[in-house]
Amino acid sequence: KEEQIIYRDCAEVFKSGLTTNGIYTLTFPNSTEEIKAYCDMETSGGGWTVIQRREDGSVDFQRTWKEYKVGFGNPSGEHWLGNEFVFQVTNQQPYVLKIHLKDWEGNEAYSLYEHFYLSGEELNYRIHLKGLTGTAGKISSISQPGNDFSTKDADNDKCICKCSQMLTGGWWFDACGPSNLNGMYYPQRQNTNKFNGIKWYYWKGSGYSLKGTTMMIRPADF
């Protein structure tokens, strides 16, 4: 039987000669467990593993800790790839994180973090970021230093409230902080003055809910 090639991320897929956008099967580091991920082979040279996408409100992002751990949605559409996979892969080598944003007026912007990784589940998948560049604000809309991940059934934020219940969605909430890309999806003309929407404060401010978001990772040495 022909031996199957194992890919740890979309950068490995790209380097193997598969350079078309689409869904590929990736394998967890040091494991045989597999996950389906969308690979962006065009943006900034390709090789990006998409870990989150919002585009139309078709998927409910008010999910449990376990669902955010293993992932949900459809990799070709709205989805969350899964905190456990992202933790494992970003602890193998240095990764960059690119966050691409769209507003309802046809504008696009991005934030690029030159070093990104998650802590493990025992540390609540705490986010670690360094070196921000990009057009979506000079200040990071993910609070620094990074916070623990919170969901509707796991309150790890710094607010007396439960941010995930107040603002909806799982995120690295502060108290509750300047971003939540997993908030409620609001259609055009209903997207302003929505404090529980898809927020990236240092680009669009407090009450603006975005049209689209993509979070993607790639090895720093790609």
Partner: antibody
Framework: QVQLVQSGAEVKKPGASVKVSCKAS????????MVWVRQAPGQGLEWMGY????????GYNQKFEGRVTMTTDTSTSTAYMELRSLRSDDTAVYYC??????????????WGQGTLVTVSS | DIQMTQSPSSVSASVGDRVTITCKAS??????VAWYQQKPGKAPKLLIY???TRDTGVPSRFSGSGSGTDFTLTISSLQPEDFATYYC?????????FGGGTKVEIK
Amino acid sequence: QVQLVQSGAEVKKPGASVKVSCKASGYSFTDYNMVWVRQAPGQGLEWMGYIDPYNGGTGYNQKFEGRVTMTTDTSTSTAYMELRSLRSDDTAVYYCARTRDRYDVWYFDVWGQGTLVTVSS
Amino acid sequence: DIQMTQSPSSVSASVGDRVTITCKASQDVYIAVAWYQQKPGKAPKLLIYWASTRDTGVPSRFSGSGSGTDFTLTISSLQPEDFATYYCHQYSSYPPTFGGGTKVEIK
């Protein structure tokens, strides 16, 4: 200490406009959203809208949309609320208040002393 | 808009009395409720936020409770300076709204 000082009382004719100011001191002006709340004589409190001094972003209560404009001057740490096409039922005390958070419009921890606007022909 | 229905609209009480004011939201507001005290001719003053957290400097005789749609402000032992009007405020949903107020008067 943290305080908000508002401009003095105004008497206006119906159809006119009024611009109320609110000067902040004792904290970093751009770190907190500012809201405007009004109170008609003997009545309750009514939220008019907010402004984020950091980026100028605003959100208005639909009831006042098109008639109200909120602005700030960060060089003087002053917020302004202009209400146009005044009617007699706009007679009220207008308050500015600071929200406890930059990123959300939640509860209001510091209030100005209020500005009485009387609309009368 | 979410309606905040406060009751009673007024209450007569004596110094030392326990006073309870309730506020009912027309839909679930989680714990996103604040309480303010207002004296005649003065601006409102924040007492409680997140339904039960006292603001800095607020005496311990003031307490708040509740979640969802039903909220309570309690003054455990009324003091002379507590005679005022009290307002609840929801900030869970846009636009923020206030209750109609409860006037606490001297009996």
